[in-house]
């Protein structure tokens, strides 16, 4: 059966870093969306071999891509707070086919030590509770807005 | 350039099943949600059934649950709405449309199909 490859498990930053997520395929896909959760998820890039990729408005200008669709590396660069979240691959294939998922903490330089990844995979549930004394935006409510709605008519 | 083709429309007798297809081109088709409309004589446009971008959930007008189902194959860029047991009230030009939901790159974009004849009748 195909699946999803996604690598890393989690990774903490400082802001202003960069972020390499991986998602590695056995092939036959139509494209690949790199998704972030919530209870709202939220579509960050699809890319498609030979097509220009899409990119979510709030990551634009700090998104670079490596490889193919079939084993794709996400770069995503001048990290903020409101981007700590768990990010997954997501292949379009005949079946849905999801990775596991990468939680981002990204983190001030001075609370570096507040929370470190742990070896397991992470759980979309939830992300851990910030420090005392501040408050990491929602990374729902943090994005930019979208794009207008297009014109469109009925037949 | 976009655009969406429904096919699969016919003459079918009371009791008869069709499968109509709605195959898209010019824009990436697992970004959007999916519907059928219906339109009789005289009548307004109606929603008959909803498909969320990846398959997980789909819902239906009340008249035509346990009868129709609707689907998708976003590797084939291609939605589909299986009628069976149909009745002569489902005669209608039946409209496949594509709508970007929250969360989607494309949100708000929303695109329609040029509809396919259904005529139900003995």
């Known amino acids: 059966a195909q699946e999803v490859q996604q690598s890393p498990h989690c990774t903490t930053v400082p802001v202003g870093a960069s972020v390499n997520i991986t998602c590695s395929t056995s092939g036959g896909l139509r494209g690949i969306y790199l998704r972030q959760l919530g209870p709202q998820p939220q579509d960050i890039i699809y890319y498609e071999d030979g097509v220009v990729p899409t990119t979510d408005r709030r990551f634009r200008g700090r998104i670079d891509f490596s490889g193919s669709q079939d084993n794709l590396t996400i770069t995503m660069h001048r990290l903020q707070l409101s981007d700590t979240g768990t990010y997954t691959c997501q292949a379009i294939t005949e079946v849905n086919v999801y990775g596991s998922g990468t939680l981002v903490l990204v983190t001030e330089e001075q609370s570096q030590g507040w929370h470190r990844c742990s070896d397991a995979p992470p759980r979309a549930s939830a992300l851990p509770a910030p420090p005392t004394g501040s408050a990491l935006p929602d990374p729902q409510t943090a994005s930019a807005l979208p794009d207008p709605p297009a014109a469109s008519a009925l037949p | 350039a976009v655009q969406l083709v429904d096919s699969g429309g016919g003459l079918v007798q009371p009791g008869g099943s069709l499968r109509l297809s709605c195959a898209a081109s010019g824009f990436t088709f697992s970004g959007f949600a999916m519907s059928w409309y219906r339109q009789a004589p005289g009548k307004e446009r109606e929603l008959v059934a909803t498909?969320?971008?990846?398959?997980?959930?789909?819902n239906y007008e009340d008249s035509v649950k346990g009868r129709f189902t609707i689907s998708r194959d976003n590797a084939k860029d291609t939605g589909y709405l299986q009628m069976n047991s149909l009745k002569p009230e489902d005669t209608a030009v039946y409209y496949c449309n594509a709508e970007a939901p929250a969360g989607s790159l494309w949100y708000g974009n929303n695109y329609w199909g040029q509809g396919t004849q259904v005529t139900v009748s003995s």
């Open positions: 498909i969320s971008r990846f398959g997980e959930s789909s």
